[in-house]
């Protein structure tokens, strides 16, 4: 079971990223799928080690105080959410914005029906060219 | 099916980065290999995680406008060079560089034959330092 | 055999990242234990994909002029340490500090015994918040 | 759902050029590659060559320079020229989609019969 | 090219019987190796590849192994819709070839 998206820019104003099955994208079975574009979601317990890329463009002027903040998130069947993992990059100072990468990767016991989504502070810093953003997951 | 090479400095002018055999190394058995120093090369068709890591050292002030960008990219026996990853990290300002670390990894499907290799902007600023910039795969 | 163990703050002195089985952690069994909260020690024999994040909290005037620096590194029985990976970060000019995020991930073999475990140059800058940094492993 | 259509002539004369066209539906030719495979009666399967779904190509160097495969992504159709034909290449002509990203065929046509006499 | 030798070239078996195809390669081929079925006037389908992955919609009476040089495809409980020639074919470099056909019929 082993899942990789591709991210895909959006028109909604929500934090959570939308992604796409999409250029060199793997989607191995139906064990695990992408749902609504926006989060993938397993149908077999176990153990699975999940990673997401997000590359952001973004300016310390034209952005608030606070970091970019990327959080890879789990929602469970009738559990509330919770974060799993998260990264943090101050700004950068160059203009009209400074590039820079996130990698979060971590081994995470999911139930059946468990989903992941990742969560970003401002979505319409994300980078969506070929390659710099994605997600994914695989079972041991 | 596993491999993790080390980074190699290089008198060669090309944006592929060069690896190793070396240090603590792993190349499980000959079902990957390490060619021409350059990619990695799987003889067996599936699903890979493949990462690699890259730190480097630059100046705003001595470098292009244009971010340092690493790519994951493949070649598939016949077929077309193409991205699989990017990340990119804006030149910092420190003298007489600043030091930053990028780190790439996802599940591709691979086919016989398939290399996989690394490129960056400007390979004179990668670190080759012990355990700084290093490339690997396992299958699942 | 899996694990992923979350940071934890220390009082102690020492450069090397404390750890815990503390809010959405994984200890697969017992062939992989964390000893004393700082290492990782597998029982068994084999090929390991070993990550860690640290996310840090830095300013360029406060800190020594020298890159915040994570490393990961192993000690088998009988061996000396050695560095499996490392990562640098320049620190921001961001006030009172700014957040950056690392992240390391890679293959080894380990012997029975041997346990990895996470140097930081300066702990004090760790960031121990939600899913901000943590360290893990799996047998492939 | 998934479907391969074959199509063309069912004579050729000893010499001249052979086209065939193969319909797909159920699938983009973007994202799967397609496979001529060809089998004489009563005899095996033999791989003719690949149309790539990033638009390149690759052919079965035993067949010599013959076979030129071409695409219509407009019109979800890949095309196989072959020429020269002699009657030993008098066959069955099978397109056939690769699977995702994988080298192996899931799904087939019909198949076109040809006869070169 | 790499040449591909099956064996048998026809067998027959009685229904609910277990069969096994054999098929020698003349290099390694790193488990790169697929098993079709062609039933009597029909195009091949895709039952094995990776030498012991099983094709969707495959059923699990068939199954697949080997390594090196050589592979067998296991037909379980055999069913009438069995009745069919098999192929196996190698996708370790290029050009891709198929083993000559092994044709199975019931007793």
């Known amino acids: 079971i082993a899942a990789h998206v591709i991210s895909e820019a959006s028109s909604k104003t929500t934090s959570v990223l939308q992604w796409a099955e999409k250029g060199y994208y793997t989607m191995s079975n139906n064990l695990v799928t992408l749902e609504n574009g926006k989060q993938l979601t397993v149908k077999r317990q176990g153990l699975y080690y999940i990673y997401a890329q997000v590359t952001f463009c973004s300016n310390r002027e034209a952005s608030s105080q606070a970091p970019f903040i990327a959080s890879l998130c789990l929602k469970s069947p009738g559990r509330f959410e919770r974060i799993l993992l998260r990264a943090a990059n101050t700004h950068s100072s160059a203009k009209p914005c400074g590039q820079q990468s996130i990698h979060l990767g971590g081994v995470f016991e999911l139930q059946p029906g468990a989903s992941v989504f990742v969560n970003v502070t401002d979505p319409s810093q994300v980078s969506h060219g070929t390659g710099f953003t994605s997600f994914g997951l695989l079972k041991l | 099916i596993a491999a993790h090479v080390i980074s190699e400095a290089s008198s060669k002018t090309t944006s592929v980065l060069q690896w190793a055999e070396k240090g603590y190394y792993t190349m499980s058995n000959n079902l990957v290999t390490l060619e021409n120093g350059k990619q990695l090369t799987v003889k067996r068709q599936g699903l890979y995680y493949i990462y690699a890591q890259v730190t480097f050292c630059s100046n705003r002030e001595a470098s292009s406008q244009a971010p340092f960008i690493a790519s994951l990219c493949l070649k598939s026996p016949g077929r077309f060079e193409r991205i699989l990853l990017r990340a990119a990290n804006t030149h910092s300002s420190a003298k007489p560089c600043g030091q930053q670390s990028i780190h790439l990894g996802g599940v591709f499907e691979l086919q016989p034959g398939a290399s996989v290799f690394v490129n960056v902007t400007d390979p004179s600023q990668v670190s080759h330092g012990t355990g700084f910039t290093s490339f690997g795969l396992l299958k699942l | 055999i899996a694990a992923h163990v979350i940071s934890e703050a220390s009082s102690k002195t020492t450069s090397v990242l404390q750890w815990a089985e503390k809010g959405y952690y994984t200890m697969s069994n017992n062939l992989v234990t964390l000893e004393n909260g700082k290492q990782l020690t597998v029982k068994r024999q084999g090929l390991y994909y070993i990550y860690a994040q640290v996310t840090f909290c830095s300013n360029r005037e406060a800190s020594s002029q020298a890159p915040f620096i994570a490393s990961l590194c192993l000690k088998s029985p009988g061996r000396f340490e050695r560095i499996l990976l490392r990562a640098a970060n320049t620190h921001s000019s961001a006030k009172p500090c700014g957040q950056q995020s690392i992240h390391l991930g890679g293959v080894f073999e380990l012997q029975p015994g041997a346990s990895v475990f996470v140097n930081v140059t300066d702990p004090s800058q760790v960031s121990h918040g939600t899913g901000f940094t943590s360290f893990g492993l799996l047998k492939l | 759902q998934v479907q391969l259509t074959e199509s063309g002539p069912g004579l050729v004369q000893p010499s001249q050029t052979l086209s065939l066209t193969c319909t797909v539906s159920?699938?983009?030719?973007?994202?799967?590659?397609i496979s001529w495979v060809r089998q004489p009666p009563g005899k095996g399967l033999e791989w003719v060559g690949v149309?790539?779904?990033?638009?390149?190509?690759l052919y079965n160097s035993a067949l010599k320079s013959r076979p030129s495969i071409s695409r219509d992504t407009s019109k979800s159709q890949v095309f196989l020229k072959m020429s020269s034909l002699q009657t030993e290449d008098t066959a069955t002509y099978y397109c056939?989609?690769?699977?995702?990203?994988?080298?192996?065929?899931?799904?087939w046509g019909q198949g076109a019969s040809v006869t070169v006499s | 090219d790499i040449q591909m030798t099956q064996s048998p070239a026809s067998l027959s078996a009685s229904l609910g019987e277990t069969v096994t195809i054999e098929c020698r390669t003349s290099?390694?081929?790193?488990?790169?190796l697929a098993w079709y079925r062609q039933r009597p006037g029909k195009s091949p389908q895709l039952l094995i590849y990776?030498?012991?992955r099983l094709a969707d919609g495959v059923p699990s009476r068939f199954s697949g192994s080997g390594s090196g040089t050589q592979y067998s495809l296991k037909i379980n409980s055999l069913q009438s819709e069995d009745v069919a020639s098999y192929f196996c074919?190698?996708?370790?470099?290029?050009?891709?070839t198929f083993g000559g056909d092994t044709k199975l019929e019931l007793k």
């Open positions: 056939a989609r690769g699977k995702m990203h994988y080298y192996v065929l899931d799904a």
């Open positions: 159920g699938f983009s030719l973007t994202s799967h590659h």
């Open positions: 149309m790539w779904n990033d638009g390149g190509t």
């Open positions: 290099e390694d081929i790193y488990s790169n």
């Open positions: 990776d030498t012991n």
């Open positions: 074919q190698h996708y370790s470099n290029f050009p891709w």
